[in-house]
């Protein structure tokens, strides 16, 4: 029979031979021959493979540095990576997590739209007409304005984006 | 061309240890398992066991596993099969062997345990 | 161990005609991975062997189209379809499927 130029799934072609891949948790240790099937062994302790393969050496898994404001979300198996996350009050800088930065707060003016988490930073928006924020914050929302009405009061100081109204008292000197 | 070439005979008395050599060229030593198999005369061949070059990985015929040691030394594409506390049966020629894309054979060393 | 069990033990043959070669083993050679590792190489006297046939039927490179192999399971042949002078000499089966590896009795070739 003519060598194969192609093989199934889950093997590889080396010196005319379809050879069996490893599967996910194990490394190549010797490719098939006329005589042998793949010879693959699991990966060690901390290593890992994610996919069917012939490779010759298995992934580190990734270290999650504390100096770094990392810490484990999920433990890497013989198969899968660490998934590291960020410490409180922190986030990933890229999508890979290798490193974190502080959330950023919200200056005045600004309310939180979007609460951070492990992987994405705190989303502000400018406080709307008829909402403030008057301090830097990482969880505020916009407030409303302060209702004078509805205590009976009126509206001595307009608000703005960073300040509350100010109400005062109903001009009793009125007709 | 791939060459598998051998040590030369040697004679020993019986309890005396033997070490055959196995040179490899002409493919990436590391690549291929090398395997040795004997010959005595006027008899069947018999499989000792083989040594993955890339991590001295062994795997034995156990017959053989408690007298026969397998080594490799790549910087000099070497394969090494010693065999300890000899007796008259041991008599044989001894081959390595290399398979995966073809198979080679070495030119085989005789081994003869006389007293 | 896998004992392997080759006739007849000797084949006197007529140059040009055909010639077969048995070979059984005690267990299945069926790999879990689906292939039948049983080989056949040919030994001339004095010389170091050289492969034939792997996984039952296929020729090594260089090896002429007269030498072909069959068979499954336990049961395999060796078949050479025109004898030629220089197929002189010992044939042997063997398995790599069980560890540890073992060989046939082999079979001596001679012509009449």
């Known amino acids: 029979p003519e060598p194969p130029t192609a093989c199934r799934e889950k093997q590889y072609l080396i010196n005319s031979q379809c050879c069996s891949l490893c599967q996910p948790g194990q490394k190549l240790v010797s490719d098939c021959t006329e005589f042998t099937e793949t010879e693959c062994l699991p990966c060690g302790e901390s290593e890992f493979l994610d996919t069917w393969n012939r490779e010759t050496h298995c992934h580190q898994h990734k270290y999650c540095d504390p100096n770094l404001g990392l810490r484990v979300q999920q433990k890497g198996t013989s198969e899968t990576d660490t998934i590291c996350t960020c410490e409180e009050g922190w986030h990933c800088t890229s999508e890979a997590c290798e490193s974190c930065v502080l959330h950023r707060s919200c200056s005045p003016g600004f309310g939180v739209k979007q609460i951070a988490t492990g992987v994405s930073d705190t989303i502000c928006e400018p406080c709307p007409v008829g909402f403030f924020s008057n301090v830097s914050s990482a969880f505020e929302k916009c407030h409303p304005w302060t209702s004078c009405e509805t205590k009976d009061l009126v509206v001595q100081q307009a608000g703005t984006n960073k300040t509350d109204v100010v109400c005062g008292p109903q001009d009793r000197l009125r007709a | 061309q791939v060459q598998l070439v051998q040590s030369g005979a040697e004679v020993k008395k019986p309890g005396a240890s033997v070490k055959v050599s196995c040179k490899a060229s002409g493919y990436t030593f590391i690549s291929y398992y090398i395997y040795w198999v004997r010959q005595a005369p006027g008899q069947g061949l018999e499989w000792i066991g083989g040594?993955?070059?890339?991590?001295?990985?062994?795997n034995f015929n156990e017959k053989f596993k408690s007298r026969a040691t397998l080594t490799v030394d790549t910087s000099i594409s070497t394969a090494y099969m010693e065999l300890s506390r000899l007796r008259s049966e041991d008599t044989a020629v001894y081959y390595c062997?290399?398979?995966?894309?073809?198979?080679?054979w070495g030119q085989g060393t005789t081994v003869t345990v006389s007293s | 161990d896998v004992v392997m069990t080759q006739s007849p033990l000797s084949l006197p043959v007529t140059l040009g005609q055909p010639a077969s070669i048995s070979c059984r083993s005690s267990q299945s050679l069926l790999h879990s991975n689906g292939n039948t590792y049983l080989h056949w190489f040919q030994q001339r006297p004095g010389q170091s062997p050289r492969h034939l046939i792997y996984q039952v039927s296929n020729r090594f490179s260089g090896v002429p189209d007269r030498f072909s192999g069959s068979g499954s399971g336990t049961d395999f042949t060796l078949k050479i379809s025109r004898v030629e002078a220089e197929d002189v000499g010992v044939y042997y089966c063997?398995?790599?499927?069980?560890?540890?590896?073992?060989f046939g009795g082999g079979t001596k070739v001679e012509i009449k």
């Open positions: 063997s398995q790599t499927t069980h560890v540890p590896w073992t």
């Open positions: 040594i993955n070059p890339r991590n001295g990985g062994t």
């Open positions: 062997t290399r398979h995966g894309n073809g198979v080679y």
